[in-house]
């Protein structure tokens, strides 16, 4: 297993709509054909998987149906939207990069970015 | 370490075909990466020529296309360049060098071997 | 094919100064740029991937930049080992090189 150099911005604040997007981009010393990204969040010291998807570069991003990851590549650069938020989501959001094929398998692993989500107000009751 | 070194002939007279190999140490070219062939002209100028893949798929530069080939021994992990119809315009010295997927920063080279076109 | 305009051609530089070269690029090559430094007899040394990124052992004096079509290359703190040849290189589509910058020292 080969590492690789994975960048993630620090910190990203979800909408109020509960969606956060932000790049993982992976430093490659060549062109793979086949690379595989995972999302997983990381809270109170528990890892989950967020979400994964596995691409040939120059072709989209297909997660699952129900997953709640969408995503599209350019180059090196993986744009990563999250939808469905709730503040008890609020976690550090790690971006996993692996090069599948041709071989060896690289490996990359962000330092995380961590999302804020803040749930909105409900709006007061009107009087009209 | 990963250790790559040319050989082959130094001389070579017009037309007729170009031969080279390079030995691989400490990695097996069948494992992964591309094994290329580049070479530097006289003035310092530097040609990517082909490679083959790890798993015998070839690429070429398609200005040498019809002239070159790129085959492999996996016994004795060494890679070959064959290159017809040489002209002095072939006068260079040429290295082997390793990279990682379909193109790519070139890791590893060999030490490079001089080749003269010259009747 | 992708061809690399690499300046200048030579140049000429104190001991502890700093130099830089660039690389212009005929089209976006997505962050795909190498740079190497090669010396006479060997093989080219490879310093930098992915425009940025130091290849292990890779003294920290030595960094690039850039995005697009133009890139940058630089030697801070400048050592006497470090009179070479250094050459650019895309990997976006196909492999290609710039035609060198010669390094000497004053």
């Known amino acids: 297993c080969k590492a690789m150099h994975v960048a993630q911005p620090a910190v990203v604040l979800a909408s109020s709509r509960g969606i956060a997007s932000f790049v993982c981009e992976y430093a490659s010393p060549g062109k793979a054909t086949e690379v595989r990204v995972t999302v997983l969040r990381q809270a109170d010291s528990q890892v989950t998987e967020v979400c994964a998807a596995t691409y040939m570069m120059g072709n989209e991003l297909t997660f699952l149906d129900d997953s709640i990851c969408t995503g599209t590549s350019s180059g090196n650069q993986v744009n990563l939207t999250i939808q469905g938020l709730r503040a008890m989501d609020t976690g550090l959001y790690i971006c996993k990069v692996e090069l599948m094929y041709p071989p060896p398998y690289y490996l990359g692993i962000g330092n995380g970015t961590q999302i804020y989500v803040i749930d909105p107000e409900p709006c007061p009751d009107s009087d009209f | 370490d990963v250790q790559l070194q040319e050989s082959g002939p130094g001389l070579v007279t017009p037309s007729q075909s170009l031969s080279l190999t390079c030995s691989v140490t400490?990695?097996?070219?069948?494992?992964?990466?591309?094994w290329n062939w580049i070479r530097q002209f006289p003035g310092n100028k530097l040609e990517w020529m082909g490679y083959?893949?790890?798993?015998?798929?070839?690429n070429y530069n398609p200005f040498l296309k019809n002239r070159i080939s790129i085959t492999r021994d996996t016994s004795e992990n060494q890679f070959f360049l064959k290159l017809n119809s040489v002209t002095t315009e072939d006068t260079a010295t040429y290295y082997c060098?390793?990279?990682?997927?379909?193109?790519?920063?070139?890791?590893?080279w060999g030490q490079g071997t001089s080749v003269t076109v010259s009747s | 094919d992708i061809v690399l305009t690499q300046s200048p051609s030579s140049l000429s530089a104190s001991l502890g100064g700093k130099v830089t070269i660039t690389c212009k690029t005929s089209?976006?090559?997505?962050?795909?740029m190498a740079w190497y430094q090669h010396k006479p007899g060997k093989g080219p040394r490879l310093l930098i991937y992915?425009?940025?990124i130091l290849q292990p052992g890779i003294p920290s004096r030595f960094s690039g930049s850039g995005s697009g079509t133009d890139y940058s290359f630089s030697i801070n703190n400048l050592e006497p080992e470090d009179i070479a040849t250094y050459y650019c290189?895309?990997?976006?589509?196909?492999?290609?090189f710039g035609g060198g910058t010669m390094l000497e020292i004053k």
């Open positions: 400490g990695y097996s070219i069948t494992s992964g990466y591309s």
């Open positions: 060098a390793r990279n990682y997927g379909t193109w790519g920063a070139m890791d590893f």
């Open positions: 290189q895309q990997y976006d589509n196909l492999n290609t």
């Open positions: 089209q976006d090559i997505n962050k795909y």
């Open positions: 992915y425009t940025s």
């Open positions: 083959i893949r790890f798993d015998g798929n070839n």
